[in-house]
């Protein structure tokens, strides 16, 4: 139920990457505004994005308090200019979001190859440890800090002259791989959380190739 000139929000969708988390919904408002509430399963509702005409609300500040909790949000619809108005049941129209557990569901952001260094027939490839918006003791945690050994990286590497992608894996942010002497290689990395059943993989990092600035070559 609700007032005749408001419609309930629908298609409530969580959009989350590396814990930056936004709730999106439809429709674009016509003569109405929205307020969002969020809570954990056992917690109290907290209001965010008061009387907004947007169809999204950044809930990052709330979910980073405990990324392993499961959250529920709801979007209230109010008539524009008359936000005290309620539906026939005595409360404004609202719609619930799906449940969202950040630790299990946030998308893994595109990783970046920080550097690579060749020493003889070995190459050390280092992946940048991306900062998240999750805090502990007033400092922002990295992706590795949050996920620990649950997070692995897959390295794809190939000779510049060929197409077949060899793979290596690490549960740190570094790879040490064997390469053929005198060959140039290209690299791309992918973040993976194997324990998940969905959203297990990130998109691939930009490709970096030997002979470009990021790398360092030392003949031993």
């Amino acid at each position: 139920s609700g007032t005749t000139n408001t419609v309930a929000a629908y298609n409530l969708t969580w959009k989350s990457t590396n814990f930056k988390t936004i709730l999106e919904w439809e429709p674009k408002p016509v003569n109405q505004v929205y307020t969002v509430q969020i809570s954990t399963k056992s917690g109290d509702w907290k209001s965010k994005c008061f009387y907004t005409t947007d169809t999204e609300c950044d809930l990052t500040d709330e979910i980073v308090k405990d990324v392993k909790q499961t959250y529920l949000a709801r979007v209230f619809s109010y008539p524009a200019g008359n936000v005290e108005s309620t539906g026939s049941a005595g409360e404004p129209l609202y719609e619930n979001s799906p449940e969202f557990t950040p630790y299990l569901e946030t998308n893994l952001g595109q990783p970046t190859i920080q550097s690579f260094e060749q020493v003889g027939t070995k190459v050390n490839v280092t992946v940048e440890d991306e900062r998240t918006l999750v805090r502990r003791n007033n400092t922002f945690l990295s992706l590795r800090d949050v996920f620990g050994k649950d997070l692995i990286y897959t390295l794809y590497y190939w000779k510049s002259s060929s197409s077949g992608k060899k793979t290596a894996k690490t549960n740190t942010n570094e790879f040490l791989i064997d390469v053929d002497k005198g060959e140039n290689y290209c690299f791309s990395v992918q973040a993976v959380i194997p324990s998940r059943t969905v959203n297990r993989k990130s998109t691939d990092s930009p490709v970096e190739c030997m002979g470009q600035e990021k790398g360092e070559f030392r003949e031993i």
């Epitope: 692995i152 897959t154 794809y156 197409s163 077949g164 992608k165 060899k166 793979t167 290596a168 894996k169 690490t170 549960n171 064997d178 992918q190 993976v192 194997p194 324990s195 998940r196 059943t197 969905v198 959203n199 297990r200 993989k201 691939d204």
Partner: antibody, heavy 120, light 107 residues
């Protein structure tokens, strides 16, 4: 329940082509990696190649490089093995298998296999 | 490519026997070794991963161990359903490679 079902095997002449399919259910192939492994009659297991369906990256055993191509149709949740210029020594049961993708666990599920016979 | 040399190629044993199969890697593969069981006409099944971890649902009579580049599969007390062929496989580097297999037959 995780399942992999291969199809498309059969009798083919030397120099001919065949396309095998591997239909997956119970998981989304783009979240994992898919391998093809073969086994000649009375012989051991031989790795053929892999695909990461998420990005299309592949790698092949030297014995099939340039002749076999692995692809994936993520909308159909199916992986494929296109085999060209087939030789008698390619006669085998071909298995597709799921790579769990962790540091520890490698192939955790296998299909039932499909027999490819290359003979004139 | 890394070679996995498996031995013996076959063995005969009785129900209740302790059976040991070994695999030697041609270079360091850390613990990235799995063991599979295959019965005639069937697909292989994962028994052991990461050299020594028992896969879900596999009986505890199966165990794996590592010593350097040597890997061992042990069946502590052979059961009738264990007569099969066993393969080791390294997945430390691409391409992954299998051992030649060990056929465990009834004595």
């Amino acid at each position: 329940e995780v399942q992999l079902v291969e199809s498309g095997g059969g009798l083919v002449q030397p120099g001919g082509s065949l396309r095998l399919s591997c239909a997956a259910s119970g998981f989304t192939i783009s979240d994992y990696w898919i391998h093809w492994v073969r086994q000649a009659p009375g012989k051991g297991l031989e790795w053929v190649g892999y695909i990461d369906p998420y990005n299309g990256y592949t790698y092949y055993a030297d014995s099939v490089k340039g002749r076999f191509t692995i692809s994936a149709g993520t909308s159909k949740n199916t992986a494929y093995l296109q085999m060209n210029s087939l030789r008698a020594e390619d006669t085998a049961v071909y298995y597709c298998a799921r790579d769990y993708g962790s540091l520890q666990v490698f192939i955790d599920y296998w299909g039932q296999g499909t027999l490819v016979t290359v003979s004139s | 490519d890394i070679q996995m040399t498996q031995s013996p190629s076959s063995l005969s044993a009785s129900v209740g026997d302790r059976v040991t199969i070994t695999c030697r890697a041609s270079q360091d593969v850390n613990t990235a070794v799995a063991w599979y069981q295959q019965k005639p006409g069937k697909a292989p099944k994962l028994l052991i991963y990461s050299a020594s971890f028992l896969y879900s649902g596999v009986p505890s009579r199966f165990s794996g161990s590592r010593s350097g580049t040597d890997f061992t599969l042990t069946i502590s007390s052979l059961q009738p359903e264990d007569f099969a062929t066993y393969y080791c496989q390294q997945h430390y580097t691409t391409p992954p490679t299998f051992g030649q297999g060990t056929k465990v037959e009834i004595k």
